[in-house]
Interface confidence: low
């Protein structure tokens, strides 16, 4: 590994400077991909901080970065202005470059922060040169809050500093007023004042009246040694701006600002919600904003003014929708620091927060909404609706874009078409069936979180209030009695005050549900059944002929019945009775009542009937009594617990 580049970075005071390949350039003899050339920050900066443009600039200190990120200009050094003035300051970063299997290389990056540098974002070379605001025809003191060259003094070692001063020479005088030092006017014959006089509050600007045009003066500032001797050191030539304002002027009042929200890489207009002021005596075009500091997640642009960034704009630009924020690929939120002025009052600081939204959200549907049949309603939970993006979105909002067919969504017991994730989490959002003709329903919602939306369909099903037999296998070729030990909707009957009805939707695959003749005198054999009631179950009038699977060797099998259960005043529900079957075993105690057993298993006690070739059970015995298996009637009774 080898390290090229100057390993020095020059930074303007209080600014952000990207590390570049000129500053830091690693290479390896193996021609390693820059993504694999890794820098570790062994000792971070003391006068500022190192951070990644694409990551949260307020978070943890940067620990690792790659050469590729340096090439991309994503590794930034930010100088933090100290409270004490300085002319030049030096910072160092200790880095360790690694790219296995090569040996690590230690590197020191020197950072020079200097007012000497030409800085676009800090055009003055002085600690402060902010300009002055003065009412028309009046006077105002120019203090070190507005003009301060104490950073030039800071270039002198502190023991000698008290013997030095900064001499200001006015090279162009104000045209609409006068400068006075200790009440004496400055003029071409006496164009000087000192930093010490500034600090003592002795410099005054007196406006001559006759209008509110801009004024100012140009000056040269340099160090002055003991007894007024000129000394080598930093110097600068600059202008000091003086804004004259109408004495009757009412300053603009900034209004509360709503953060701008947009997705990565998109653009969005900035409206009065983000930037507005109340100023009765200024037109929107007269209220000017200037960007003091921009975030790293994008820039402001003016529509009709090309695509590039702008640093100055007016309230008129905002009001007409011409100002937009263009987001780059960063996912980090940021803040614009702005100054706002109506051209007559001192500038006021303002800020514009920009939230970068997820480019997509997902509505997670973990399970359909199950409505208990007897209740006919159920609360939605996070199981049904939850929004995630790059994180969970607890502040998601939902809007119904396709309502349910057979019910309503309720909040506070009243129909609603909009609700929040918070309301879901609190169990306040309820689905209630209002039309009891379907066992299922669905509705479509549009979820909105941090400005991004996604739609989803929530399915609703009714959970049957039905007790279903869950015992061991049933004998193939037998007919068993369907009674409340197998299917029981008695609780539903009690809750609804009605006789529940069943409709066979599907199955069984091998066998059939039949109605059993009431007595020997009742004509005909068993009848195929598609509908029955709870009363039929309780009367023992139903049988399930358990068939044998065709075309395969005898053995255990599975089968099921799918039923729709209806009752008065509640939605119907679909339920299934799943059961296992096996070849009939006379020695096995079956825990259901058998109305007949396979022909081969019958004794003389039962009237022989022929079995169907397919293995379906033969016709029922004409007696409602169960058929007697081998081993006698008593053993059959005992085995089947038949009563």
């Amino acid at each position: 590994l080898s390290l090229k580049g100057s390993q020095t970075l020059t930074v303007c005071p209080g600014s952000v400077q990207p590390l570049s390949s000129q500053t830091l350039r690693a290479s390896s003899s193996a021609g390693t991909d820059p993504q694999l050339l890794l820098y570790r920050v062994v000792r971070g900066p003391q006068l500022g901080r190192l951070f990644h443009a694409q990551q949260d600039s307020t978070g943890e200190a940067l620990v690792n970065f790659t050469q590729a990120e340096v090439y991309a200009g994503n590794i930034l050094y930010e100088h933090e202005m100290p409270p004490e003035p300085f002319w030049e300051a030096h910072d160092t970063l200790e880095l360790q470059l690694s790219s296995p299997p090569a040996r690590d290389v230690a590197a020191t990056l020197a950072v020079a922060v200097s007012f000497e540098a030409a800085c676009p974002q800090h055009p003055s070379h002085l600690w402060k040169n902010k300009g002055l605001w003065v009412p028309e025809g009046q006077r105002a003191r120019i203090t070190v809050a507005a003009l301060d060259a104490s950073n030039l003094l800071a270039s002198v070692p502190s023991p000698q500093r008290s013997e030095h001063d900064v001499l200001f020479q006015v090279t162009q005088f104000p045209s609409r007023g006068q400068l006075l030092v200790s009440e004496e006017p400055l003029h071409a014959g006496q164009p000087h004042f000192l930093q010490s006089q500034l600090a003592a509050g002795q410099l005054v600007y007196a406006h001559g009246g006759g209008g509110t045009q801009q004024d100012g003066f140009h000056f040269r500032a340099h160090l002055q040694g003991p007894a007024g001797a000129s000394v080598a050191g930093p110097q600068t030539s600059e202008a000091f701006a003086i804004t004259v304002r109408d004495v009757n002027e009412r300053p603009p009042q900034p209004q509360a600002s709503v953060p701008l929200r947009l997705t990565r890489g998109s653009r969005a207009p900035i409206s009065r919600a983000q930037l507005s002021v109340v100023d009765p005596d200024s037109a929107p075009g007269e209220i000017e904003y200037e960007v003091q500091r921009a975030p790293h997640n994008g820039f402001l642009s003016l529509v009709g003014g090309g695509l590039g960034p702008v640093t100055r704009f007016t309230q008129a630009d905002v009001d007409s929708g011409r100002l937009a924020f263009v987001a780059n690929g960063s996912s980090v939120a940021g803040i614009f620091q702005l100054s706002m002025s109506d051209g007559a009052s001192p500038p006021l600081p303002m800020s514009l927060a920009v939230d970068i939204l997820p480019s997509a959200i997902e509505v997670q549907l973990r399970a359909p909404l199950e409505v208990p049949q007897a209740l006919g309603r159920s609360s939605l939970s996070q199981q049904q609706l939850r929004v995630v993006s790059d994180r969970e979105e607890p502040e998601a909002a939902y809007r119904l874009i396709q309502g349910p067919q057979y019910g309503h969504l309720l909040v506070g017991g009243r129909p609603t078409s909009a609700f929040s994730q918070f309301q879901i989490d609190q169990g306040e959002v309820v689905f209630a069936f209002t039309n009891f003709s379907s066992s299922h329903d669905h509705f479509r919602v549009l979820a909105l979180a941090r400005g991004v939306n996604a739609s989803a369909v929530v399915n609703v099903t009714v959970r049957a209030l039905l007790h279903v037999w869950a015992g061991g296998p049933w004998p193939q070729g037998a007919t068993l009695r369907l009674d409340p030990t197998v299917l029981d909707a008695g609780e539903l009957a009690n809750r609804t005050g009605s006789v529940p009805r069943f409709r066979l939707l599907e199955g069984p695959r091998h066998g059939r549900v039949v109605r059993v003749p009431r007595a020997r005198t009742e004509p005909g054999g068993s009848q195929l059944v598609e509908q029955f009631t709870q009363q039929d179950l309780e009367d023992g009038r139903l049988g399930l002929e358990v068939g044998r699977p065709e075309g395969r060797a005898p053995g255990p099998a599975g089968d099921s019945l799918t039923l729709e259960l209806w009752a008065q005043g509640v939605p119907p529900a679909v339920a299934s009775l799943d059961f296992a079957t096996e070849p009939y075993n006379a020695a096995r105690p079956y825990s259901v009542a058998l109305l007949s057993v396979p022909e081969a298993a019958r004794t003389e006690a039962g009237k022989p009937e022929s079995s169907t070739p397919t293995g379906e059970p033969g016709p029922m015995a004409s007696s409602p009594e169960p058929a007697v298996a081998k081993g006698g009637f008593l053993s059959f009774l005992e085995a089947n617990m038949f009563s």
Epitope: V303, G304, V310, T314, A316, G321, A324
Partner: antibody, heavy 112, light 107 residues
């Protein structure tokens, strides 16, 4: 690159409504900012008629405001101009533009 | 409405000449000014936006300057394809308005 193409009748009778459509290709109408209509009377300068923004807001030239409607159809990536109660003074080449890019213009003559 | 006044209304120049067109706004428009070039039978083309920013694909011989109410379009060395009519347009205040145009002809 965004391209714009005006379409509509070249001849409109006085007192009727002039209707033009601008089809945007190479970009989405919801991505741009301002979709403008501008006209140029024969041998004369340019006059801004109005715009519709990417989010559907309008602004019109006050001199034409009472007669102008600009609308959009995002599904077709088009925006339209309707100018009612036309007179011979509305005879002009009508351009659709986002200022960076312009359509080639279409001449509309108002005559009976 | 803001009135935009261009001068001169027309000028004759030769290939290679330096040409300057001025545009004056009836009130301050800061830097919210575009310049367009239009050739006969064609749509205007954006040359310069925001007073001095060159639109993509526009030759560097075109430049713009000014602020407030007075603006200038300069063609440093006139080329045969530059003979056309030039318009300024303000977008500081609605309604957006254009200058009446300056026709640059061959001397």
């Amino acid at each position: 690159q965004v391209q714009l193409q005006e379409s509509g009748p070249g001849l409109v009778k006085p007192s009727q409504t002039l209707s033009l459509t601008c089809t945007v290709s190479g970009g989405s109408i919801t991505d741009g900012y301002y979709w403008n209509w501008i006209r140029q009377h024969p041998g004369k300068g340019l006059e801004w008629i109005g715009y519709i923004t990417f989010d559907g807001r309008n602004n019109y030239n006050p001199s034409l405001k009472s007669r102008v409607t600009i609308s959009r159809d995002t599904s077709k990536n088009q925006f339209s101009l309707k100018l009612s109660s036309v007179t011979a003074a509305d005879t002009a080449v009508y351009y659709c533009a986002d200022f960076d890019y312009w359509g080639q213009g279409t001449l509309v003559t108002v005559s009976s | 409405d803001i009135q935009m006044t261009q001068s001169p209304s027309s000028l004759s120049a030769s290939v290679g000449d330096r040409v300057t067109i001025t545009c004056r706004a009836s009130q301050g428009i800061r830097n919210y000014l575009n310049w367009y070039q239009q050739k006969p039978g064609k749509a205007p083309k954006l040359l310069i936006y925001y007073t001095s920013s060159l639109h993509s694909g526009v030759p560097s011989r075109f430049s713009g300057s000014g602020s407030g109410t007075d603006f200038t379009l300069t063609i440093s060395s006139l080329q045969p394809e530059d003979f056309a009519t030039y318009y300024c347009q303000q977008y500081s205040k609605l309604p957006w308005t254009f200058g009446q145009g300056t026709k640059v002809e061959i001397k």
